[in-house]
């Protein structure tokens, strides 16, 4: 029999390299049975996760899974960091693994790193 617990399917150590000034949607895959749980996003600041209250979010429903989406309209350099989604379900708090956004910023050609550096770990050069 399939479990009817709420499950959040963010993979351990998941990460996204994204470009400042571009739109981006961060998805929290949510599996639930009957009633859709209340889901929130927070951003890690040291050991605490600060709830993102004033950010645009939406639900996307698919056949076997739903997605709670955090919208970046657009991505800003200070969006760099780790995020977590949490679901309240029957008085229980279920937390996802954290997912990390590496925000890359366009630099002028004179500041360009070497090709090898950029190809291997581009985000480190633009934090």
């Amino acid at each position: 029999k399939e479990s009817c617990d709420v499950q959040l399917y963010i993979k351990r150590q998941s990460e996204h390299s994204i470009l400042a000034g571009d739109p981006f949607e961060l998805e929290c895959p949510v599996k639930y049975c009957a009633n859709r749980p209340h889901v929130t996003w927070c951003k890690l600041n040291g050991t605490t996760c600060v709830k993102l209250e004033d950010r645009q979010t939406s639900w996307k429903e698919e056949k076997n899974i739903s997605f709670f989406i955090l919208h970046f309209e657009p991505v800003l350099p200070n969006d760099n960091g780790s995020y977590r989604c949490s679901a309240n379900f029957q008085s229980n708090l279920i937390e996802s693994h954290s997912t990390t956004l590496y925000v890359t910023d366009v630099k002028s050609a004179s500041e360009r790193p070497s090709k090898d550096e950029m190809a291997s770990r581009p985000w480190l050069l633009y934090r």
Partner: antibody, heavy 115, light 114 residues
Framework: EVQLVESGGGLVQPGGSLRLSCAAS????????IQWVRQAPGKGLEWVGF???????YYASRAKGRFTISRDDSKNSLYLQMNSLKTEDTAVYYC?????????WGQGTLVTVSS | DIQMTQSPSSLSASVGDRVTITCQAS??????LSWYQQKPGKAPKLLIY???TLASGVPSRFSGSGSGTDFTFTISSLQPEDIATYYC????????????????FGGGTKVEIK
Amino acid sequence: EVQLVESGGGLVQPGGSLRLSCAASGFDISKYNIQWVRQAPGKGLEWVGFINYGGSAYYASRAKGRFTISRDDSKNSLYLQMNSLKTEDTAVYYCARGLSNSDLWGQGTLVTVSS
Amino acid sequence: DIQMTQSPSSLSASVGDRVTITCQASQSISSWLSWYQQKPGKAPKLLIYRASTLASGVPSRFSGSGSGTDFTFTISSLQPEDIATYYCQSTYGGVVGSTSDDNPFGGGTKVEIK
């Protein structure tokens, strides 16, 4: 409704100038990277350049020195000023929101360079 | 300068077939690659960005993979509405703030139904 609308295309003689506009609605154009892409009749896509959210413009070498991308935040619009036009600049010109994640495109405006 | 080589330039497949298009960069572009679909008379539509991330609202039959210089775009089960031309685009030059003498778009692949 979130959209981009290009305008300003038309017929121009070789050596002439034209200014294309890209008007945004439903979002603040100044916060985004916006790229210009063109497509000659029956050909593939060709990158022209882009302006980043900080206002810095970058160009393909074929456009450098002849084309200028600018922004008017008060009009929520972007412009492509094209000078010294050549017959090979004949194309549909598109503006698109985002560089890596270009999720929104205009319908395009046709520029014909011919004598 | 980065050159993008896309192949094949055209292909014909049956409804339900798996379709694969490749794009090769002349130097490493990490994962800064997008894939677009364009139908006649219409603007391009983003399908995949960052090599493998499905754009919002795009059916899951479309997928992308690869990094460095070699990239693949796949339609797992071709549908009649997928008839279009598909393009890859390297956004690496924009990311590092350089520009290229070459076009960061591949030459396109026209997909037709058998």
